[in-house]
């Protein structure tokens, strides 16, 4: 679970250690932050639960792929 | 105003070393900021050597620079590159440059007017 | 890997013209992760755009970005002979590879 530091940074300690579906993914944010320890992606998932992954791993890399893509094509 | 200015730039033989010191003035690092050095050899595009967060410490690097170059934080003001086993290619204008806030998305607005390192024998 | 790539290596364009400059990524980087800098001879780098779209503190409106995923835009219009520069984009999605976070920049001439 992410935790947040202060009102406006989120940080992730931990990382999951299960790869997630990405039909169970509704969105993602990157953190960047300068004042958290490590780089982090936060997914969303559909049932709005949010879980820190390691944007390192490459289910990571292709699930935030999926939902770049996603997030391109208009729904019709 | 904020300012970054960059020290230490100097000409050194091949296989020898050196350390740039970045001064901000202006602002304190206790607000937080990705403070990352930036080179840039004659006529060629920029290179991200590494860069610190200004508050906790955390470092990142390019693969090539890892273990011959090491950043630091000296002071609430100052970062440095340390840069060892150089050679000719590691001659360029090196470049202090400071994120526009904490986060890396935001780019860098902030950059010092570069500091000249010329490796030859 | 987060690569980033620019076409062409030059262009040249006429005082009142457009220019259009192209960044391409080797994987997505989704739609707020990039930045373009504007820098002259002997200077460093100005920032000009971050998050894409959005105009850093006083940079003209003829500038704008665009793009999501892999392939972002810089498009100058209404040129100046002061545009005359090199033109760099960098992704902001990853600080973990810094390895070619910039583009290999694009020169501007202004005829």
């Known amino acids: 679970q992410p935790d947040a530091i202060n009102a406006a940074v989120t940080c992730c300690y931990n990382f999951t250690n299960r790869k997630i579906s990405v039909q169970r993914l509704a969105s993602y944010r990157r953190i960047t932050s300068s004042k958290c320890p490590k780089e982090a992606v936060i997914f969303k998932t559909i049932v709005a639960k949010e879980i820190c992954a390691d944007p390192k791993q490459k289910w990571v890399q292709d699930s935030m792929d999926h939902l770049d893509k996603q997030t391109q094509t208009p729904k019709t | 105003q904020e300012q970054l200015v960059e020290s230490g730039g100097d000409l050194v033989k091949p296989e020898g070393s050196l350390t740039l010191t970045c001064t901000a003035s202006?602002?304190?690092?206790?607000?937080?900021?990705?403070m990352c050095w930036v080179r840039q050899a004659p006529g060629k595009g920029l290179e991200l050597i590494a860069c610190?967060?200004?508050?906790?410490?955390?470092t990142y690097y390019a693969s090539w620079a890892e273990g011959r170059f090491t950043i630091s934080k000296t002071s609430s003001t100052t970062v440095t590159l340390q840069m060892t086993s150089l050679t000719v290619a590691d001659t360029a204008t090196y470049f202090c440059?400071?994120?526009?806030?904490?986060?890396?998305?935001?780019?860098?607005?902030?950059w010092g007017p570069g500091t000249l390192v010329t490796v030859s024998s | 890997a987060y690569d980033m790539t620019q076409t062409p290596a030059s262009v040249e364009v006429g005082v009142g013209g457009t220019v259009t400059i192209k960044c391409q990524a080797s994987?997505?980087?989704?739609?707020?992760?990039l930045s373009w800098y504007q820098q002259k001879p002997g200077q460093p780098p100005k920032l000009l755009i971050y998050?894409?779209?959005t105009l850093a503190s006083g940079v003209s409106s003829r500038f704008k970005g665009s793009g999501s995923g892999t392939q972002f835009t810089l498009t100058i219009s209404g040129v100046e002979s002061a545009d005359s520069a090199t033109y760099y984009c960098?992704?902001?999605?990853?600080?973990?590879?810094?390895?070619?976070?910039f583009g290999g920049g694009t020169e501007v001439v202004v005829k």
């Open positions: 440059a400071r994120t526009t806030d904490d986060n890396w998305n935001v780019g860098f607005n902030l």
């Open positions: 202006g602002f304190s690092f206790s607000t937080s900021y990705w």
């Open positions: 610190i967060s200004s508050s906790i410490g955390v």
């Open positions: 994987q997505s980087i989704g739609n707020r992760y």
């Open positions: 998050g894409t779209s």
């Open positions: 960098q992704q902001g999605a990853t600080i973990s590879y810094l390895d070619n976070a």
